[in-house]
Every structure is written in structure tokens, then in C-alpha cells.
């Protein structure tokens, strides 16, 4: 029977600045019965304070609510483990919110065959981003890419389409089936999880070069 | 007929300025991708700066960042390439190239000569 | 740091087969971005031949023809031509660069 390995902090995502969850992965657990508290101070601050919320992220997690949560401010955090025999610390994890947005998956992703009169027909792709990240306040700039393949290809196509919420391919293969998927990140975060995929029926009389 | 004409390059002492622009013709220019793509004497290409077709976003090599400002006129048919704070490494010929999907720079300008010397 | 790679020179005789190369990385074209082709002919501008890993720009002869595997992609030039002397480039988006990429170039020469 031993005191309990080190645990270790390794991911904090916020999905929209406003909250954000940490995750920790517990050391040894010595052979005993083990508590896990996260402790926490804001840069500046010396007053240390416990994870408000142990339940919303699920095991091993602190979750902080919107009450809890400041952009302007960097987070310095650990988290203590502690059975019979003893304690031991994670190392100082500093956390800034800005930085580890990581927003849900675009939505209302549409793909339609255009065949104009007078030009080569395309594969038109919209989206819309997702909706807890507000756009509108100016402190998000999302990204987005796009990737494609036909139904039994191996490879997928990937398109960095900036902040265009629309994107258009020219070239595919006639008569296939094909899945297309978008994703986001804001410019200082993570991607988002792919976009359930939608799939298109490219027409057998699709022109296939442009 | 596609056709696109750089202006602008020139001779400038380091530390200088140039405005480079791209006339474009034949085809609408508002909807396209636009990028700069530049080739310093016997080298190889060098992508430089690209603008979506909204304006608002751009990107730029990390040779150039802070330095260089791409914009776009849509209504005169126009790409611009501010370049300041110009330093030797920056001599080369600099080309405008049309994004098509995927970016790929499907029509080529014939190219401007930038010298940078003192 | 990023970086596509290309064999500085090939060569081949009328009528031979040959292929460049053009090697990446996790960031660029083993990230699944796609691999674009750039013919340079002599004093010229560059010209698109090959766009999205393996179509062919509109006006460009089958002779020519793409591919891409892994954090790979090679271009192929078949029956060779003496106006197929001149600089090949590959390109392709870099995610950690936020930019777009292109490789050191290859010369070709018609022997």
C-alpha cells in the first residue's frame, strides 16, 4: 500500500469562451481508496479555490460554469490526490480560455449539384457554424474546412475554406456517391468533431473537367 | 479571355515601400480567391499572401506578416499588394494568380520585378 | 518546419516515362490536403496542370497525370516531349502554417 501516483491534467475545452471543462488523468492508485480535488487561483490572485463543479464533464473532471469562467484572466490549476498513505500534486497547469475553444461541429451542412446553362456544373457546399459560438460580438473568427470522397474511396479531400461558410468543388467523378463533412475551429483553439456526413448523388451527365 | 496585369514593382532602397497592383479582366473577379505568389532570382515559388472573396480574411507567409497587406478593389477588378519595410530578401518577381475551388491558382499574371538594393 | 520535397532534377529521353516526386508531412498532404501541380516553362509565368492530387487543368495533354498516397504525391509525365522541358512545382495547404506550400521545385530536362 502506497500514497497515490501523480495525476496529471491533460486537456481543458471550452465550447464558446464562456465555459470550459479540464480533464485529469489519475496516477497509481497506491491500492486504496483515492480522492481527487482540483484547486485553482487566477494569475494575480493568491485566494485558492476549489473545482465548483466535479459532475458536468464526467470522471476526473471540473467543470466551470459560466459564473466561474473569465477570458481575461489565465487559470492556474492542479489537482491533488490523496488516500491513507499520503498526497501527491500535479504539476501547475496554465490555463487560458481563449485558447482552448474547441466549438461543436458547423451545422445545417447542405451539398447540391448546380448544372448553370452557360458554365460547367459544381458541387455547392453550405453550412452554418454552430450555434453557441456568437460571431456577432467580434471576439470569434472561425474557420472552417471541408473534406469530401466518393462513397469507396479510401483518402478524403480536405479544403481549407478561411471563414466562408460556402464552398464550391468543380470537379468529380460521374455517377458517384459522395460523402462530404465541414468542421470549424476558431483562430486560436482546436478543430471541432467532422459534421455528420451528408451524402450526394453526382448525375451520370456531371461534366467531370473543368 | 482571362487576362490579369501586375504593375507596381520597381526598384526601392531597403526599408521602402511599393504598392503592387492586378488588373484582371475577362470573368468575374469578385468571385474568386486571389493570391500573390513571388519568385526571387533563379529560386523556386514562394507563396506570399492570399484574400477570400469576402475581403475580410486573409493570410500571409510568415516572411511577410506585419509587413505585407493584401486587399482587393471588387469593383474595379483590382488585387493589391502594400509591401513596407522592404528588405533585399524581398527582390523577386511577384505574380498575382486567380483561386479557383480549392484554391488552386488556376490563371497566372506574367509577373512584376521587385528589386530591393541599396 | 515544414517543407514539401522534390528531387532537384530528372531527366529522360523522347518518348520515356517520368515521375516526380513531392514529399510532406502529417501538416500538409498526409493531413489530407489536397496536392496541386505547376508546369514553369522557361522565362514564363507558371501554369496549373494538375489541381486536387490528380485532374487535369482543361487544355493539358493525358500524358500528364497526378497522384497521391500517404504524405506523398508524384507526377507522372509519359511519351515525353522536348516542350516538356521546364521547372515542376508541388503545392499544397500547410495547417500548421496556416499557408500554402510549395516545393523546392523540380527541373526537368529532355535529353
Known amino acids: 500500500q502506497l500514497p497515490p501516483g501523480k495525476p496529471e491534467i491533460f486537456k481543458c475545452r471550452s465550447p464558446n469562451k464562456e465555459t470550459f471543462t479540464c480533464w485529469w488523468r489519475p496516477g497509481t492508485d497506491g491500492g486504496l481508496p483515492t480522492n481527487y480535488s482540483l484547486t485553482y487561483h487566477r494569475e494575480g490572485e493568491t485566494l485558492m479555490h476549489e473545482c465548483p463543479d466535479y459532475i458536468t464533464g464526467g470522471p476526473n473532471s471540473c467543470h466551470f460554469g459560466k459564473q466561474y469562467t473569465s477570458m481575461w484572466r489565465t487559470y492556474i490549476m492542479m489537482v491533488n490526490a490523496t488516500n491513507q498513505m499520503g498526497s501527491s500534486f500535479s504539476d501547475e497547469l496554465y490555463v487560458d480560455v481563449t485558447y482552448i475553444v474547441q466549438p461543436d461541429p458547423p451545422l445545417e451542412l447542405a451539398v447540391e449539384v448546380k448544372q448553370p446553362e452557360d458554365r460547367k456544373p459544381y458541387l455547392w457546399i453550405k453550412w452554418s457554424p454552430p450555434t453557441l459560438i456568437d460571431l456577432k460580438t467580434g471576439w470569434f473568427t472561425l474557420l472552417y474546412e471541408i473534406r469530401l470522397k466518393p462513397e469507396k474511396a479510401a483518402e478524403w479531400e480536405i479544403h481549407f475554406a478561411g471563414q466562408q461558410t460556402e464552398f464550391k468543388i468543380l470537379s468529380l467523378h460521374p455517377g458517384q456517391k459522395y460523402l462530404v463533412q465541414v468542421r470549424c475551429k476558431p483562430d486560436h483553439g482546436y478543430w471541432s468533431a467532422w459534421s455528420p456526413a451528408t451524402f450526394i448523388q453526382i448525375p451520370s451527365d456531371f461534366t467531370m473537367n473543368d | 479571355e482571362v487576362q490579369l496585369l501586375e504593375s507596381g514593382g520597381g526598384l526601392v532602397q531597403p526599408g521602402g515601400s511599393l504598392r503592387l497592383s492586378c488588373a484582371a479582366s475577362g470573368f468575374t473577379f469578385s468571385s474568386y480567391w486571389w493570391h500573390w505568389v513571388r519568385q526571387a532570382p533563379g529560386k523556386g515559388l514562394e507563396w506570399v499572401s492570399d484574400?477570400?472573396?469576402?475581403?475580410?480574411?486573409?493570410n500571409y507567409a510568415d516572411s511577410v506578416k506585419g509587413r505585407f497587406t493584401i486587399s482587393r478593389d471588387n469593383s474595379k477588378n483590382t488585387l493589391y499588394l502594400q509591401m513596407n519595410s522592404l528588405r533585399a530578401e524581398d527582390t523577386a518577381v511577384y505574380y498575382c494568380?486567380?483561386?479557383?475551388?480549392?484554391?488552386?491558382?488556376?490563371?497566372w499574371g506574367q509577373g512584376t520585378l521587385v528589386t530591393v538594393t541599396s | 518546419q515544414s517543407v514539401l520535397t522534390q528531387p532537384p532534377s530528372a531527366s529522360g529521353t523522347p518518348g520515356q516515362r517520368v515521375t516526380i516526386s513531392c514529399t510532406g508531412s502529417s501538416s500538409n498532404i498526409g493531413y489530407g490536403y489536397v496536392v496541386h501541380w505547376y508546369q514553369q516553362l522557361p522565362g514564363t509565368a507558371p501554369k496549373l496542370l494538375i489541381y486536387r492530387n490528380n485532374w487535369r487543368q482543361s487544355g493539358v495533354p493525358d500524358r500528364f497525370s497526378g497522384s497521391k498516397s500517404g504524405t506523398s504525391a508524384s507526377l507522372a509525365i509519359s511519351g515525353l516531349r522536348s516542350e516538356d522541358e521546364a521547372d515542376y512545382y508541388c503545392?499544397?495547404?500547410?495547417?500548421?502554417?496556416?499557408?500554402?506550400?510549395f516545393g523546392g521545385g523540380t527541373k526537368l530536362t529532355v535529353l
Open positions: 503545392a499544397a495547404w500547410d495547417d500548421s502554417l496556416n499557408g500554402w506550400l
Open positions: 494568380a486567380r483561386g479557383l475551388d480549392a484554391r488552386r491558382m488556376d490563371y
Open positions: 484574400i477570400a472573396r469576402a475581403s475580410s480574411y486573409t
